[in-house]
Every structure is written in C-alpha cells, then in structure tokens.
Interface confidence: low
Amino acid sequence: KRFHDVLGNERPSAYMREHNQLNGWSSDENDWNEKLYPVWKRGDMRWKNSWKGGRVQAVLTSDSPALVGSNITFAVNLIFPRCQKEDANGNIVYEKNCRNEAGLSADPYVYNWTAWSEDSDGENGTGQSHHNVFPDGKPFPHHPGWRRWNFIYVFHTLGQYFQKLGRCSVRVSVNTANVTLGPQLMEVTVYRRHGRAYVPIAQVKDVYVVTDQIPVFVTMFQKNDRNSSDETFLKDLPIMFDVLIHDPSHFLNYSTINYKWSFGDNTGLFVSTNHTVNHTYVLNGTFSLNLTVKAAAPGPCPPPPPPPRPSKPTPSLATTLKSYDSNTPGPAGDNPLELSRIPDENCQINRYGHFQATITIVEGILEVNIIQMTDVLMPVPWPESSLIDFVVTCQGSIPTEVCTIISDPTCEITQNTVCSPVDVDEMCLLTVRRTFNGSGTYCVNLTLGDDTSLALTSTLISVPDRDPASPLRMANS
C-alpha cells in the first residue's frame, strides 16, 4: 500500500504534483507500513473500539486564507471523551472527581504509555527500535521527552505527506510559494501507540485557500452609532475605518502598504499609508465604499528579458523596488502583475487586496449636554433622599428614550439604572428627574437614544447632607 491509498481519494494531476512541491514533505507514492499502522476508513466497525471510553475527535484548523508565498499554519487538537485528559508524562488519565457514563474510575489511567515505552526490549541502545518509526519507516526524531509523545499525525495534501510525532495538540506550517491558487484539501490521520504498533483514532479534513489577493477586512466604528454591525451610520459624525490585513505569518511585515479609499460621496480618492482613516458623511443616503490595498511582497522573479533585436530596443524592466530576503520564489497567479527585477534575485511583486461595502447614512443624535442641575425640595418624610432635575439639550435627531445610570464616583459600580420614553420638541430641551439616596458623590451617565443612535454624556455630582444651606455641586462634566 502507498500513502495515497491510505490518506485520501483526492489525486492531484501529474502537473499539480510536480508544481506543488512542499519543502520537507514527501511524495505520497511512498510505501505505507500497514503492519505497524493498520488502515481503516470510514465505516470500519473497529473505529468504535479504537479508544477506551468513546471516540476521540480531532479538530483541524488553519489560519487560511494565505497569501501565496506566506506560511499557512495548521493546528490539530485532540478532544478526548469526557473525563479524560493528557497528563504531563503524555499518559491519558481520568480527571479527578469527574463522573462519566461509567461513573468514577478506580484506575487513574486510560492509557499508561510510560509503563511500556520505558521498556527498552528490542532497541539497539540508541533508543531506536523497529517500532519507533513513522508509517514510511523513517525513525522518530529524538527530541527531549520524545517518549512522552504518543500520537502520530500524518498530514496529507497535494500528493505529499508530512509525519509528526506529538502530544494531544500539534501545529504544522507550510510555505505556500509553490502552491496552486485556490481551495486545497488538507487531510490528517491520527494514530496512537498500541503496544509495539499503532492504532488509528481519528481522521479529519479541512479546506484551506491560497490566494494572490491580500485578505482584507475593515472594521467601522462611529461614536453614538447604536449598532456597529448593521452598516448604518450617522450623518455629520466621523466614522473610523480600520483595515485589518490577514497576515498571520507576518509575510508583509517589511512591505510598504498603501490604502486607497473611495467613500462613494464624491469626495474623491484618499490614499494613505495608515491602516486607519476617519471620514464624515454630510448627506443622508446609501454610499458604496471601496478600498484597494497594495503591498510590495516577496515574489517570483520574471524571466530575464530576451536580448534586444538590433532594429527595436526593448525597454528594461523596472528595478526600483527594494531588495527582500524572500522565501523560495513560487507561482504568482494568473493576473497580469507588476514585477520588479533586482540584481540579487530577491524580487518583489505588487499584491492587491480589495474591500467593498454599501453603507447607509441617516440622521442621528449627535451630541447631548447637561446644561443645568437643580435640587428639588423634598417633603419631610424622606429626609435621606435628594431629588435632582437635570436639564438636557441635544443636537441632531430627536430622541425617543432617555436612560440614566447612577454609579459610584469611579463610574464602575452601578447603583441604579432607569430608562423611560421621552417626548421632546424640536428644540431638543428636556428635564430628567432622578432620586439619589443619601449624600455623597455620584457618577451620572445620561444617554439619549433613538432607533439608530445613542448619545452619552457623563457627570460627577456631589449631593450634600439635607442641610438647606448646602448647595448642589456639579463636580465635573
């Protein structure tokens, strides 16, 4: 049996196999040792008994999408049946005081691998034996503590495989310089030690994507916007746009990145090297926001230009972009791309990313201010309470509700929250009456809201003892 017989049905073409060489990976035409690593596929009845106490689930994740040339990292995490965990020695043990369907276990071990792995029977004195090998026969690497690593992970993609000895969680990084653009499939098979052989315990697959487009996300934030995720914002207040480039392997760390904005409101293009920008829309309506990101990234070098014909001199390729210690040059995709040739062959290529959104601009409450506070005289039965009127003004649209949050002087511990509907005239002037129990300093957060906006103002007030001579003070606003 060969690796491709064991590890999946996806058979890349000869072209794909030739042009997708992954550094450190091996061809799945290699032979698989079926004696040490028995082969089961889905539906085999032995899967049910391959792990004591239930099935092990393998979770495969990646930081896809990956810009071609960058590294993509795959992580596999094993999820054991309830009440089981891996201990510091790599053995699988029952968690203390944890009850599963079988009740509490008297035996602390699910699998006590230490017991047999320290038995050197059959070894040649170097810690190596005929069974401490991967499915292709390569010996296990002897890292410190390798005996405590009891799981064998076999990664398979693009007609190649990578073997790794590990614990209940492993990570593998792959450089994508030679990977064809588009979605690809990664499959992982996990084996556990079983005496002097191995038993499959889990199989998992996941699609990853290699792209020549810079993966771009934009977050948008605006003060007073009630719902930041609905792409509806307020007129006459700045919106902060923050560009997030998905580059987990820091491939673009040394690249100059340009951001080109079109806000869709006839304010023209805005080009910046900063990943954040503020923009204020001054009209209501629907606008198409467009962003283009450009980065000079490490990339393949173009072929040298042909020698010029005597009759027609050929223009030389630009050599203006900076040198870069690049990874192995790889395919750059099918689009016409700007290439720069550099004498030391560390070439760069301009990569692009795009973001588009349709945003809606509406009226909203732009600002709220407390312009006056008045201590209302209380009848005698409530000597400990103070009644205070807040006179509030606002700008923008007319609010439909008011909330006050009364808290301690640090504004952290809420003591009282009251919300109520309001009916406000065009002048947006209203009085909010609130009760304070006892003297002292209070933080007051006052918000005015409507369907799309929520405007806030805060103040610290000092409520005096119930001595009529003591004035009410606004500590700060």
């Epitope: 028995p38 082969v39 089961w40 889905r42 539906g43 085999d44 009845m45 032995r46 899967w47 049910k48």
Partner: antibody, heavy 122, light 107 residues
C-alpha cells in the same frame, strides 16, 4: 483456504423463529474484521442484512430486520449466528454468510458462503 | 439510505468484445464501491473494491473507474466464463446497499 459454511435454513411459518449458523475456517476468525449476513430473494438482487465486529461488541442491522433479527458470534467456535424471530414472508431468501474485507474499514465482502435457503410460508 | 442505480439491467455481447456496466450513487460515496460477479446457483465473488482496486486472483481484463458519483465496471476481451450477473455495492455507509444487478449474456 478460507471457507464459510452456513446451516440452519429451512421452511418456517410466519411469526416463527429460525437460527442460522456459519462455521468459518482457513483464517483467524477473531482477529479479522467483521462478519455479515447478506440475503438474496429468489430471482432478486442482493440485500445486506446485518454485520458484527470482530470482537462481537458492535452490531448493525438494516431497518426492516431491526428488533427481529440478532447477529452474534462465538469466536471460540469460529462461528457466527443469525437468530431470526417473528419471520415474515418477505424474509424468504437465500442467506449468505460473508466476511468483511480484513485489512481495513471497508465493508465489502471478500469471502462468501454457499448460502442457505430460508422459506417463510404458511 | 444511499441508492445505487445500476444499468443496464441486461446486455448481450460477443466473445472478445468490451462491455461496460454502470452504477450511479445517490450521493457521494468517496470511491467506496465494490463490484461482484455471481453465476447461477453460486455465491457472489468480489471483483473490484475501492472503485478501482482489483481483488487478488481476478483477471486484469476487469477494471473499475469513477467519475463523480458514477462508477463503471469494464470487462475487456470478453471470455465465455464472464457470462454472469454483476452487482455493485456501496461500502461507504450503513446500510450497505447493492445495485439491482446486470445480467451479461454471451451471443
């Protein structure tokens, strides 16, 4: 040489029971993959009935026989069984004992017995 | 349940000819398909598993292939002993299901 020999078939009335046996030889019965029963009604196609894992701990049935048929095995005797209760006329068929392919997951059948006829009729 | 639609139900061919029998799965079975040959009064014999892997002892004139959920059994240079009924079976998931069969006769 792998051999599977069925026995226990015959004519039975609806609602009655019958127990089929399959004696295996030529391979290590307990260490190989599962065993199964597959049936074939007269002049009809093949229909998988039930499977059992090598240790006997896992059993699988087609919906139409669930609750009526029981598959089991005795590894010491190298024999698997099919206990058929509440038999119906539509259970009339030749019942084949079959071995699941021994190397892996695959629930196809690499060895078959000669078959035994079960007729359910009043 | 996964349905296996086998065609044709019967066919007649001459010695030395090549014949193709097809099986269509109602959903993806990931190459988990077997082909069996059954002669009158006999039990089925495994020919092909995993869509295209030849069982030990089966002549190389039998071959299997797939395209999506469509699976094919091809018999090259037909011999007299190939007259039989052929069944496909999906071994991807329970309940395991067979095609209705194709009866191959020699002219």
């Amino acid at each position: 040489e792998v051999q599977l020999v069925e026995s226990g078939g015959g004519l039975v009335q609806p609602g009655r029971s019958l127990k089929l046996s399959c004696a295996a030889s030529g391979f290590t019965f307990s260490s190989k993959s599962g065993m199964a029963w597959v049936r074939q009604a007269p002049t009809k196609g093949l229909e998988w009935v039930a499977s059992i894992s090598n240790g006997g701990g896992d059993t699988y049935y087609r919906d139409s026989v669930k609750g009526r048929f029981t598959i089991s095995r005795d590894n010491a005797k190298n024999t698997q069984y099919l206990q058929m209760d509440s038999l119906r006329p539509e259970d009339t068929a030749t019942y084949y004992c079959a071995r699941h392919r021994d190397y892996g997951y695959d629930a196809y059948f690499d060895y078959w017995g000669q078959g035994v006829m079960v007729t359910v009729s009043s | 349940d996964i349905q296996m639609t086998q065609s044709p139900a019967s066919l007649s061919a001459s010695l030395g000819e090549t014949v193709t029998i097809e099986c269509l799965a109602s959903e993806d079975i990931y190459s988990s398909l077997a082909w069996y040959q059954q002669k009158p009064g006999k039990s089925p014999q495994l020919l092909i598993y995993d869509a295209s892997s030849l069982q030990d002892g089966v002549p190389s004139r039998f071959s299997g292939s797939e395209s999506g959920t469509q699976y094919s059994l091809e018999i090259n240079s037909l011999q007299s002993e190939d007259a039989a009924t052929y069944f496909c079976q999906q071994h991807h998931d329970y309940p395991y299901t067979f095609g209705a069969g194709t009866k191959l006769e020699l002219k």
